[in-house]
Amino acid sequence: YPPKKVTTVIQNPMPIREGDTVTLSCNYNSSNPSVTRYEWKPHGAWEEPSLGVLKIQNVGWDNTTIACAACNSWCSWASPVALNVQYAPRDVRVRKIKPLSEIHSGNSVSLQCDFSSSHPKEVQFFWEKNGRLLGKESQLNFDSISPEDAGSYSCWVNNSIGQTASKAWTLEVLYAPRRLRVSMSPGDQVMEGKSATLTCESDANPPVSHYTWFDWNNQSLPYHSQKLRLEPVKVQHSGAYWCQGTNSVGKGRSPLSTLTVYYSPETIGRR
């Protein structure tokens, strides 16, 4: 008769953790003739240090069920046993759930910390930016996002086995040009005949696509680059200037900056 009451027995203390070495034995009650070999399902090229013993090194989180058979002239299969391997959370990632499109300054924003599986299921969440803890919920919410909130975010999920971090996720905030100012080179007082360069400095995302320059009469000047070069500069160029920057989000304007052009010694001498 074939081997009777064949069972697959896990020798390890529970729980089994990912990375453990697991030993299983194939036991039976009686057999006639004697058991001469054992089979295991599934195949994993595992170690068989002795007859009826299977050793799984570095057990994976995904090992579910294993069954053995004891064989004489016939094989009797045991019911499969679940290894029930415990492991740290897997495939942790940051996902933006709100808004669905790109993020503009002032938007309400929600980030979700997702993971594919965890055993045990009880988990904790941690959010961080630049090494600073921001929250301990599965979601990170911003009621009104600001450009200063842009940066690299990570979430961590941990259980009793270990913790797993997401890849860093870059939060990009789009905003209209701001903090505009007109800077003047070589300075805000220039002698006639020399050159003066006015630069429209700004902070914008996406970058400013074009600039508009205005004089003290709010007349737009026929220049659309970031730098306005006056060469040679004339006394009539004296006055206040301001610039406007435009990107796909909107426009921003600078305060007035005054350029003073003074007469050269030659001009004064002629007078």
Partner: antibody, heavy 118, light 107 residues
Framework: QVQLVESGGGLVQPGGSLRLSCAAS????????MSWVRQAPGKGLEWVSS????????YYADSVKGRFTISRDTSKNTLYLQMNSLRAEDTAVYYC???????????WGQGTLVTVSS | DIQLTQSPSSLSTSVGDRVTITCQAS??????LNWYQQKPGKAPNLLIY???NLQTGVPSRFSGRGSGTDFTLTISSLQPEDIATYYC?????????FGQGTRLEIK
Amino acid sequence: QVQLVESGGGLVQPGGSLRLSCAASGFTFSNYAMSWVRQAPGKGLEWVSSISGSGGSTYYADSVKGRFTISRDTSKNTLYLQMNSLRAEDTAVYYCARYGSAAWMDSWGQGTLVTVSS
Amino acid sequence: DIQLTQSPSSLSTSVGDRVTITCQASHDIRNYLNWYQQKPGKAPNLLIYAASNLQTGVPSRFSGRGSGTDFTLTISSLQPEDIATYYCQQYDGLPLTFGQGTRLEIK
């Protein structure tokens, strides 16, 4: 990252021998079972042989049993396939692959071509 | 030996299509089945193991189902980079065997 690099392929006459090597890096070699899988030109995949992490258990396809020997050297992080009494039907690209927890091959080398011809 | 029969053996399809490949085992193999993708001139790449588990790094448009003798690999929305040959493989017992392959091509 896991890297497997095969070498040792080439042209050999029927009845001849060849030894393939697979250099492994990026993981703890002794923790993983390994295997050889081959692919004849224009054909599908065929499992050839496997070996346990310690090298204590080896397994072969019937078509190569008695002619091929799989082995590993943990000190060199290298897997081998000694092929003797080669036949024309052994012509194929030979891949070495790492086992996952069970017999799924989660990392593969780029392959080395073995041509058996007179 | 356990035979695996894939169908169809080749499939002409369009970008964005939902594609399903089937693999039938000659015996009950529980969920001991894997799926691989192989692009021309390249080594195979593991997509799905143990019938339904997505390998790390594989896009979520790939999914696997089935147990016993009938298994499927589904690509929810075919992308140009998915053009390849797909193989199933069983590990219920030795010898490990592969299906004959399913070649995907663009219409």
